[in-house]
C-alpha cells in the first residue's frame, strides 16, 4: 500500500476550499484535530474536519446529486414538456377546424340551417375538446345530441318548411322520433364510431405524455436518503478532512455507492421501457378511424352525407314523422 | 355533394391527390416524437453511470480515494474497503424505492396498461362490425391517405390537412414552460460544483 | 467504456458494393440509434441515415435513399452500411456513430473507415 | 431539411485567446444543437449538447449558448491541442451539420 502524503499541518488548504462552500471560517480547526464527534468521516488520524463541516458536505452532496440528476434530464424533459404542449395546441387546432369545416359545410349548403346549426356543432365540438382534455363526457351521447338537436331544424326548416309557427313545439317529439326511425340511417353511429375511437386513442397519448412529464419531475427532485447523503459525503468530501484536495474517488466505487443511492429509481427502468415501447405501439396504430385528425376533419362530410339521407327519404319521413308526432302536446313522444 | 370549404378543397376528386411528401402532418410528428423517445429507452438504467461520468472519478490517476484512504486505481480495495463498517449498501437497497417512486412506477404501470389495451393490433384498423355497417373496402391501401368511411359515394381519402407547425398560435419557448428553469446553478453562497 | 471498432479501409471498382461494419462494446447495442456519417477528402460530414437495432427502424437522408442500406445483427452488436452502384463521389470516410442516451445528439464515434472508389 | 450556416469556415488565434464560432439553423431547433471537435484520423469528439451542456471529461474553456435559430461556441484561453475543425450539429429534426470551422493558431 503507498504511503500517506504528509498530513496538511494548518489545515490551511482544507480552509480555503471550505470558505468558497461555506463563507465563514468558524466551523474549521486551525490545525488537525482527533475529530472523535465525526459520524461520516471517521478519522484514522487527525482531521481538518469539524462535525458542523461534516453536515455541511452531507448537505452539499445531496445538492450535487439534485444538479446532476437535473442536468441528465434536462435534455429529455423539455422534449417531453414541449411535445405535450404542441400536440395539445395542435389537438385544439384540429377541433377548430373541424368545426370550422362543419359550419362552412352549413352555411353553403344549408344556409337555412345556419344560426341553430353553428351553435349545435359549436357545443359538440366544444365537448370534444373537453374529452381530449380528460373531461367524464359520453362521447355517444356527444353525437347524439348533436343528431337530436339537428333533426327538429332539419325537419321544420327543410323538409317541411311550410309548418306554422303554433307546430314548433314539437321538438322533443322529433328528437325521439330521430333515434327509432333511425332518420340519419347509420350515420351516427358510424359517426359515433370514428369518434369514439379516435378521441380515445388521442386523449391517453396525451395523457401518457403528461405523465412521462411527473415521471421526469419525480426524478428530477427526489430527495435522497440520509444513508446516501452520508456514503455521498465519504466518497466526494471526506478526502478533504485528510487534506487530499486532488485526489478523486476510484470509479468501481462510484459505481457501488451510485447504485446504493439509486437503487429505487433504476426500478423505474423496466415500466419506463415499457412506457415508451407501448407509445410507439399506440402511435403506429393513429391512423384511419384512429387519427383525431383524419376523423374530425371528416365530419363535415359524412354529416353533411346524413343529411342528404334524410333528404332522399324526406317523403317517407314526414309521413310517418306526421302521424307521430300529430298529438305531441297531449303525449311526449320517447 | 357537399361544399369543401376553399382553403381545403376544389371538389371531392381533389382527394384522391396523392399526399403531399413534405407535409408536416401529426402523425409525423408523433412518430417524430417516438424516435426521439426511444433515445432516452435506457435513460434509468445508465443514471447511475451518467452520475458518475459527471462527477470526479480517477481516471488516469494511479492512486484513488476508496472512501476511507488512498488506494492504487486496480488494487481491490478501490471498490470495497470505503463501504466496510460503515453503512449496509445491502441494507440501503432493501429498504426499497422511496414511496413517491412507488406512487410514479404504479402510475406508469395504469398507463402502461391503458396503452397495450388501446393500441391497434396491425391490419385490425377497421374493426369487424364496422364493415358490416356500411363501410366499403375501396382502394384504401396508401399509407399516406387516411380512409374514412361514407356512405352514397363510397369510401372517400382524406388528405391530413394540418401543416401544424405552420399553425401553432404560438412559438413555444423553454423558458416559458413551468418547473423548466432548473438549470444547475447553485445560489451565490453555495459552491456546489466540484473541484477537479 | 463505450467503443465502436469500424472495419478496415476498402478499395472498390466503380458499380461494384460494399458493406462497412462497426462493432459496438460496452453498452446496450440495442437501445442506442446507430448512425452513419460521410466525410469526404477535404469536406465536411454529411449525416447519411441511422438505424435502431432493437426494432430495425431507419431514417435515411433523402440523399443517400437508394445508395445506402443500414442493418444490424444484435447477436453480434454489429452494425453494417452497405453502399452499392458505387462511383468515384462515394470516395470518402465513413463513420458510425452513436445517438446518446442523455442526449439525442451523437456522443461515440467509430474510428472511420475510408472507402476508396477506382478502377 | 434543415441547414446550418456554419461561420467563419476558418480563423487564427493566438495562444490564450478566445474564439467563437456561429451557427444559424435555417428554422428553430429549440436548444438541439451539438458541437464537435475533429481531428484528423480521429471520429469527432462530442463537446456539448443541447446549446450549453458540456461533456464529462471537456474543460469549461468551452462554451456554448443560443437559442431559437442563431447558436454559439466559444472557446477561452487557447491552447495548442485546440487545433482542429469545429462542427456544429442540429439534432431536433433528424440531423444535419454545419460546414465547419477550421481553427489555426497563430
Known amino acids: 500500500q503507498p504511503p500517506p502524503p504528509p498530513p496538511d499541518a494548518t489545515c490551511h488548504q482544507v480552509r480555503s476550499f471550505f470558505q468558497r462552500l461555506q463563507p465563514g471560517l468558524k466551523w474549521v480547526p486551525e490545525t488537525p484535530v482527533p475529530g472523535s464527534d465525526l459520524q461520516v468521516c471517521l478519522p484514522k488520524g487527525p482531521t481538518c474536519c469539524s462535525r458542523k463541516m461534516e453536515e455541511k458536505y452531507q448537505l452539499t452532496a445531496r445538492l450535487n446529486m439534485e444538479q446532476l440528476l437535473q442536468s441528465a434530464s434536462m435534455e429529455l424533459k423539455f422534449l417531453i414538456i414541449q411535445n405535450a404542449a404542441v400536440f395539445q395546441e395542435a389537438f385544439e387546432i384540429v377541433v377548430r377546424h373541424a368545426k370550422n369545416y362543419t359550419n362552412a359545410m352549413f352555411k353553403n349548403n344549408y344556409p337555412s340551417l345556419t344560426p341553430q346549426a353553428f351553435e349545435f356543432v359549436g357545443e359538440f365540438f366544444t365537448d370534444v375538446s373537453l374529452y381530449i382534455l380528460g373531461s367524464d363526457i359520453n362521447v355517444d351521447d356527444m353525437v347524439n345530441e348533436l343528431f337530436d338537436s339537428l333533426f327538429p331544424v332539419i325537419y321544420t326548416q327543410l323538409m317541411n318548411p311550410g309548418l306554422p309557427d303554433s307546430a314548433l313545439d314539437i321538438n322533443e317529439c322529433l328528437r325521439g322520433a330521430r333515434r327509432d326511425l333511425k332518420v340519419f340511417g347509420n350515420f351516427p353511429k358510424l359517426i359515433m364510431t370514428q369518434v369514439s375511437k379516435s378521441l380515445q386513442v388521442t386523449r391517453i397519448f396525451l395523457q401518457a405524455l403528461n405523465l412521462g412529464i411527473e415521471v421526469i419531475n419525480t426524478t428530477d427532485h427526489l430527495k435522497f436518503s440520509k444513508d446516501c447523503g452520508r456514503m455521498l459525503t465519504r466518497m466526494w468530501y471526506c478526502s478533504y478532512c485528510q487534506g487530499l484536495m486532488m485526489v478523486k474517488p476510484c470509479g468501481g466505487y462510484c459505481n457501488v455507492v451510485m447504485q446504493g443511492c439509486m437503487a429505487g429509481v433504476v426500478e423505474i427502468d423496466k415500466y419506463w421501457r415499457e412506457y415508451i415501447l407501448s407509445l410507439e405501439e399506440l402511435v403506429n396504430g393513429m391512423y384511419r378511424i384512429y387519427d383525431m385528425e383524419n376523423v374530425l376533419l371528416g365530419l363535415f362530410s359524412t354529416i353533411h352525407d346524413s343529411i342528404q339521407y334524410v333528404q332522399k327519404n324526406a317523403g317517407k319521413l314526414t309521413t310517418t314523422i306526421g302521424k307521430l308526432c300529430a298529438h305531441s302536446q297531449q303525449r311526449q313522444y320517447r | 355533394s357537399a361544399y369543401y370549404p376553399e382553403d381545403l378543397f376544389i371538389d371531392k376528386k381533389v382527394l384522391k391527390v396523392a399526399h403531399v411528401e413534405h407535409e408536416e402532418t401529426l402523425s409525423s410528428r408523433r412518430r417524430e416524437l417516438i424516435q426521439k423517445l426511444k433515445s432516452f429507452i435506457s435513460f434509468y438504467s445508465a443514471l447511475p453511470g451518467y452520475i458518475c461520468s459527471h462527477s470526479p472519478v480517477a481516471e488516469n490517476d494511479t492512486l484513488c480515494w476508496n472512501g476511507q484512504e488512498l488506494v492504487e486505481r486496480y488494487s481491490q480495495k478501490a471498490a470495497r474497503n470505503g463501504m466496510k463498517n460503515q453503512f449496509n449498501l445491502h441494507e440501503l437497497k432493501m429498504k426499497g424505492p422511496e414511496p413517491v417512486v412507488s406512487q410514479i412506477i404504479d402510475k406508469l404501470k395504469h398507463i402502461n396498461q391503458l396503452l397495450r389495451t388501446m393500441s391497434v393490433p396491425k391490419g385490425r384498423v377497421l374493426d369487424k362490425n364496422l364493415d358490416e355497417e356500411g363501410f366499403e373496402s375501396g382502394d384504401c391501401g396508401d399509407d399516406e391517405d387516411e380512409c374514412i368511411g361514407g356512405s352514397g359515394d363510397g369510401m372517400m381519402k382524406v388528405k391530413n390537412q394540418l401543416r401544424f407547425l405552420a399553425e401553432l398560435a404560438y412559438d413555444l419557448d423553454v423558458d416559458d414552460v413551468p418547473g423548466n428553469n432548473q438549470q444547475a446553478t447553485p445560489k451565490d453562497n453555495e459552491i456546489s460544483t466540484f473541484h477537479n | 467504456q463505450v467503443q465502436l471498432q469500424q472495419s478496415g479501409p476498402e478499395l472498390v471498382k466503380p458499380g461494384a458494393s460494399v458493406k462497412i461494419s462497426c462493432k459496438a462494446s460496452g453498452y446496450a447495442f440495442s437501445s442506442s440509434w446507430m448512425n452513419w456519417v460521410k466525410q469526404r477528402p477535404g469536406k465536411g460530414l454529411e449525416w447519411i441515415g441511422r438505424i435502431y437495432p432493437g426494432d430495425g427502424d431507419t431514417n435515411y437522408n433523402g440523399r443517400f435513399k437508394g445508395k445506402a442500406t443500414l442493418t444490424v445483427d444484435k447477436s453480434s452488436s454489429t452494425a453494417y452500411m452497405q453502399l452499392s452502384s458505387l462511383t468515384s463521389e462515394d470516395s470518402a470516410v465513413y463513420f458510425c456513430?452513436?445517438?446518446?442516451?442523455?442526449?439525442?445528439?451523437?456522443?461515440?464515434w467509430g474510428q472511420g473507415t475510408t472507402l476508396t472508389v477506382s478502377s | 431539411d434543415i441547414q446550418m450556416t456554419q461561420s467563419p469556415s476558418s480563423l487564427s488565434a493566438s495562444l490564450g485567446g478566445k474564439v467563437t464560432i456561429t451557427c444559424k439553423a435555417s428554422?428553430?431547433?429549440?436548444?438541439?444543437i451539438a458541437w464537435y471537435q475533429h481531428k484528423p484520423g480521429k471520429g469527432p469528439r462530442l463537446l456539448i449538447h443541447y446549446t450549453s451542456t458540456l461533456q464529462p471529461g471537456i474543460p469549461s474553456r468551452f462554451s456554448g449558448s443560443g437559442s431559437g435559430r442563431d447558436y454559439s461556441f466559444s472557446i477561452s484561453n487557447l491552447e495548442p491541442e485546440d487545433i482542429a475543425t469545429y462542427y456544429c450539429l442540429q439534432y431536433d429534426n433528424l440531423f444535419t451539420f454545419g460546414g465547419g470551422t477550421k481553427l489555426e493558431i497563430k
Open positions: 428554422q428553430d431547433i429549440n436548444k438541439y
Open positions: 456513430a452513436r445517438g446518446g442516451v442523455f442526449t439525442m445528439a451523437l456522443d461515440h
